[in-house]
Amino acid sequence: APAGPPVGVKVTLIEDDTALVSWKPPDGPETVVTRYTILYASRKAWIAGEWQVLHREGAITMALLENLVAGNVYIVKISASNEVGEGPFSNSVELAVLPKETSESNQRPKRLDSADAKVYSGYYHLDQKSMT
């Protein structure tokens, strides 16, 4: 498994209810990363041990965090995996979503040539030790 976590994790609010999280592959000896796991949650959900989870294939180092609620602080952490297993999670990065202009509808214009990379969503349940 990768010896270290992804580095340079950055979370930026790019729409009123949407953030972009970006990162770089783990430092150290060349390790082929096959998948990244992105965990995120509001502080309230974090305390409850409930994280939303996204997966991205190893070539992808960006993801969207959608449907964020103004007034909340969100916590994000990322791990890298390879054929052997999952590496450690990065340190938590926080994003405060401040109230701003009411979000406008942004249904994506229809396109026929989207690359097909699966996105999984759900909840991660972690014990308190793994939260820090």
């Epitope: 790019i14 009123d16 701003k100 979000s103 509808s105 942004n106 994506r108 690359a115 097909d116 996105v119």
Partner: nanobody, 122 residues
């Protein structure tokens, strides 16, 4: 057919200015948040700025805050990026885009066209 065409790039000296444009067609332009993203030679995609459909809400990457200004003219279906105090590290191909949402997205962004190349060099 949905189409976005970027223009306005070129060679500029450090400290100089450029104004990029992006003309949209094939969709109701004013309904969509629009983004500028860029890709430096040999580097990954970097988000630059965003503007809401009405133009009333804007966001900027820390690296361009105070130097770049995003705007739009919905009557012309056109997005703009005014770039001032340009630096060598701003050298990149710039794309306008909307966000790709859902379970079939390879990238968070879906740039159209070839983009427009901005080169900052003395």
């Amino acid at each position: 057919e949905v189409q976005l065409v970027e223009s306005g790039g070129g060679l500029v000296q450090p400290g100089g200015s450029l104004r990029l444009s992006c003309k949209g067609s094939g969709f109701t332009f004013s309904n969509y948040w629009m983004h500028w993203v860029r890709q430096a030679p040999g580097k990954g995609l970097e988000w630059v700025s965003a503007i809401s459909g009405s133009g009333g809400s804007t966001y900027y990457a820390d690296s361009v805050k105070g130097r770049f200004t995003i705007s739009r003219d919905n009557s012309k279906n056109t997005l703009y990026l005014q770039m001032n105090s340009l630096r060598a590290e701003d050298t990149a191909t710039y794309y306008c885009a909307t966000l790709c949402r859902g379970d079939s997205c390879y990238s968070p962004f879906d740039p159209w066209g070839q983009g427009t190349l901005v080169t900052v060099s003395s």
